[in-house]
């Protein structure tokens, strides 16, 4: 069937479109076209005759029409007046004809649409405002844009005309955006300029910062307002009710206690005509005096005194504050606070107690602090302790020795042989001794302000012979590689050697031993069972030598990995099960079993008689050791057969 | 269920010995060791020493040294605990009590006890 | 020897209480504790061992802590049937010491 298609339908203004012919018989003469859906004289267009190839205008050709040999026609320089229908009569050689009827839509290009407003400074929560997109143009569709977005649900958004109006109700400072409109028709599509819609609003209610409103005698006052409004408001501030000043900032130095008070701000917008104000009540507080500390012991004795720490001046309607050594005050039943914490004894003072001290008195800005109190408390004397640690010296060497005792004020010493008084010094000094120099060494401290003395006696031998050593050590049970042990060959001796056998043997060489102080200390680390041996020591000098007791260690071990005897994992039927298991381990480690997962006895050995195929499954023992904190486990399948079958016994 | 039965009570003059007896039942004789503890009037709990009735090894307590014997027999699953030389001080309940497995264990199942009384 | 003190030597506390008794080893005896309930003119019963562990049966508001030289009996909410004297004792070789003893008696 003879058809027409149009391509494009609609068309632009100015463009072009062609008139395609489908299905165009065989055998033509040749063929007309009309303006209109039928055939009229009136309203030829063209008409084409094939044998000759010559194409005749109509009375409705207007020169921008083009006909080819396929029958299509094309027109050129659309008007608006070429819209609608288009119709082909086909002559065909038998003289029978055809007709076939097309049409295309014209539309003009749109122009650049742009924006009118009823209202270019609405005013928030009063004014409405109406968007119009201009011009108007017929079978053309009209959308909004805010802010490149399509419009947002809202009961305050409004279209009308046909969506060529947009009405803002009750505008809000949020409407303050870009808006566009756009236009569209089959042929094209236009966008307006963004138009910026100037909301009026505010003032807020103002803010003043800062938010402080307590203030020191001295302090500048320096007092900030904001509120939001478009334009931006204008700023009074007002004292007690009182015009200052139109500007956003006040200020005023040296303030005193006359410049407490309600401080206003109001804020004004011109153009909304509209007023805020907020009020803030600033306290100027007068400088409270520095605060002092008193004592009614200056030179408390430990142990004995207890010392009141007032905090002066005396204020009424005041916290008092302590601090010790720049801390808070500690919990101690010996720290008592006066009920209204004004004055801190200390109860039976002690040497640790000297401080310093800090009293403060607050008021509501801050918290004025004391100079820092010392306490000189009065203390020891502790035990003397007298050095070098050396008991044994060998006849001929100069003795000497140094006494010391913790004290204050320092303690004076005095020196006894035997109970006989030697000389009042904290030093001895015996040159070349002998051994009628043997005897009691008493060191006696006296502090002249507590009256109290202590003494310390330290026996010394004299002797060519050396003593018989002993060993001491720091860990009596390491655990194995873990711990480290530090023997030492007591006691410590002048001008002597210092020697050292594990099981007979000088010791080995080993980056696990390590000998210091002299070699009178052997460190073993990170022990092993291996090291549970005999230590002993020796000390030797150019006249004697003596050997110590053998120490030996107790290394906690494993457990190891236990082992489940007999191997045997298949049994018939009938016989007895008897499962002994064992690990290494120091101390013996506690034995459990179970049996497929069942906990069973806590023994060596598992026994049960008569077993059959239900007492087949996994047979775990597990091993602990408290000591070391460790455990370990091994599991056992065992296999029941019944008596008729014989397997052989596999490990 | 674990049964631990103790001989009667037993009256016994200074310089004498006597032997307690415990039965056990309920489980196997020779996996569990047996200790002996007593208690005097009125007085707390100590403890005397040990036996693995497998082996027969024993471990007694230093201050009973040389006046105690523990024994066993398999057959009877019994243990036997006598203490000689008596003295008044010597006066307590004396119980068997299993331990609970086999090295480092306390003491899960206890006899009724048994009352020994040394008097002249 | 191992040394085990207990404390205090006896207590009395109401129904619903609870109740801590303390044991104190001479020496690190690492977990090996154990602690036993013994009843007037009756066998000592085990509650607890090393240190933590519940005998199967015993109520679970008994409960043992610690290691090393410290260890503690706690009774969550005393009973009627919780008065006894309650003994510590250590598992760690030989020779097994026991504590004095704490008698637990209702106000």
């Known amino acids: 069937k003879l058809t027409i298609e149009s391509t494009p339908f609609n068309v632009a203004e100015g463009k072009e479109v062609l008139l395609l012919v489908h299905n165009l018989p065989q055998h033509l003469f040749g063929y007309s076209w009309y303006k209109g859906e039928r055939v009229d004289g009136n309203r030829q267009i063209i008409g084409y005759v094939i044998g000759t190839q010559q194409a005749t205008p109509g009375p409705a050709y207007s020169g921008r029409e083009i006909i080819y040999p396929n029958a299509s026609l094309l027109i050129q320089n659309i008007i608006q007046n070429d819209t609608g229908f288009y119709t082909l009569h086909v002559i065909k050689s038998d003289l029978v004809n055809e007709e076939a009827t097309g049409q295309f839509r014209v539309y003009p290009e749109l122009p650049k649409p742009s924006i009118s407003s009823n209202n270019s400074k609405p005013v928030e929560d009063k004014d409405a405002v109406a968007f119009t997109c201009e011009p108007e143009t017929q079978d053309a569709t009209y959308l909004w844009w805010v802010n490149n977005q399509s419009l947002p649900v809202s009961p305050r958004l409004q279209l009308s005309n046909g969506n060529r109006t947009l009405t803002l109700f009750n505008v809000t400072r949020n409407d303050t955006a870009s808006y566009k409109c756009e236009t569209q028709n089959p042929v094209s599509a236009r966008r307006s300029d963004s138009v910026i819609l100037n909301v009026l609003y505010g003032p807020d209610a103002p803010t003043i910062s800062p938010l402080n409103t307590s203030y020191r005698s001295g302090e500048n006052l320096n007092l900030s307002c904001h509120a939001a409004s478009n334009p931006p408001a204008q700023y009074s501030w007002f004292v007690n009710g009182t015009f200052q000043q139109s500007t956003q900032e006040l200020f005023i130095p040296n303030i005193t206690v006359n410049n407490s008070g309600s401080y206003t701000c109001q804020a004004h917008n011109s153009d909304t005509g509209l007023n805020r104000t907020t009020v803030t009540t600033i306290t100027v507080y007068a400088e409270p005096p520095k605060p002092f500390i008193t004592s009614n012991n200056s030179n408390p004795v430990e142990d004995e005194d207890a010392v009141a720490l007032t905090c002066e001046p005396e204020i009424q309607n005041t916290t008092y504050l302590w601090w010790v050594n720049n801390q808070s005050l500690p919990v101690s039943p010996r720290l008592q606070l006066s009920n209204d914490n004004r004055t801190l004894t200390l109860l039976s003072v002690t040497r640790n107690d000297v401080g310093p001290y800090e009293c403060g008195i607050q008021n509501e800005l801050s918290v004025d602090h004391s100079d820092p109190v010392i306490l000189n408390v009065l203390y020891g004397p502790d035990d003397p302790t007298i050095s070098p640690s050396y008991t044994y010296y060998r006849p001929g060497v100069n003795l000497s020795l140094s006494c010391h005792a913790a004290s204050n004020p320092p303690a004076q010493y005095s020196w006894l042989i035997d109970g006989n008084i030697q000389q009042h010094t904290q030093e001895l000094f015996i040159s070349n001794i002998t051994e009628k120099n043997s005897g009691l060494y008493t060191c006696q401290a006296n502090n002249s302000a507590s009256g109290h003395s202590r003494t310390t006696v330290k026996t010394i031998t004299v002797s060519a012979e050396l003593p018989k050593p002993s060993i001491s050590s720091n860990n009596s049970k390491p655990v194995e590689d873990k711990d480290a042990v530090a023997f030492t060959c007591e006691p410590e001796a002048q001008n002597t050697t210092y020697l050292w056998w594990v099981n007979g043997q000088s010791l080995p060489v080993s980056p696990r031993l390590q000998l210091s102080n002299g070699n009178r200390t052997l460190t073993l680390f990170n022990v092993t069972r291996n090291d549970a041996r005999a230590y002993v020591c020796g000390i030797q000098n150019s006249v004697s030598a003596n050997r110590s007791d053998p120490v030996t260690l107790d290394v906690l071990y494993g457990p190891d990995t236990p082992i489940i005897s007999p191997p045997d994992s298949s049994y018939l039927s009938g016989a007895n099960l008897n499962l002994s298991c064992h690990s290494a381990s120091n101390p013996s480690p506690q034995y459990s079993w179970r049996i497929n997962g069942i906990p069973q006895q806590h023994t060596q050995v598992l026994f049960i008689a008569k077993i059959t195929p239900n007492n087949n499954g996994t047979y775990a023992c597990f091993v602990s050791n408290l000591a070391t904190g460790r455990n370990n486990s091994i599991v056992k399948s065992i296999t029941v057969s019944a008596s008729g079958t014989s397997p052989g016994l596999s490990a | 269920q674990v049964q631990l039965v103790q001989s009667g009570a037993e009256v016994k003059k200074p310089g004498a010995s006597v032997k307690v007896s415990c039965k056990a039942s309920g489980y196997i004789f020779t996996s569990y060791w047996l200790h002996w503890v007593r208690q005097a009037p009125g007085q707390g709990l100590e403890w005397i020493g040990y036996?693995?009735?497998?082996?027969?090894?024993?471990n007694y307590s230093q201050k009973f040294q040389g006046r105690v014997t523990m024994t066993r027999d398999t057959s009877t699953s019994t243990a036997y605990m006598e203490l000689s030389s008596l003295r008044s001080e010597d006066t307590a309940v004396y119980y068997c009590?299993?331990?609970?497995?086999?090295?480092?264990?306390?003491?899960?199942?206890w006899g009724q006890g048994t009352l020994v009384t040394v008097s002249s | 020897d191992i040394q085990m003190t207990q404390s205090p030597s006896s207590l009395s506390a109401s129904v619903g209480d609870r109740v801590t008794i303390t044991c104190r080893a001479s020496e690190n005896i690492y977990g090996y504790l154990a602690w036993y309930q013994q009843k007037p003119g009756k066998s000592p019963k085990l509650l607890i061992y090393?240190?933590?562990n519940l005998v199967e049966g015993v109520p679970s508001r008994f409960s043992g802590s610690g290691s090393g030289t410290d260890f503690t009996l706690t009774i969550s909410s005393l009973q009627p049937e919780d008065v006894a004297t309650y003994y510590c004792q250590h598992h760690y070789g030989t020779p097994y010491t026991f504590g004095q003893g704490t008698k637990v008696e209702i106000k």
């Open positions: 036996i693995n009735p497998n082996t027969g090894y024993t």
């Open positions: 090393n240190a933590k």
């Open positions: 009590a299993r331990e609970y497995g086999n090295y480092n264990y306390p003491l899960d199942y």
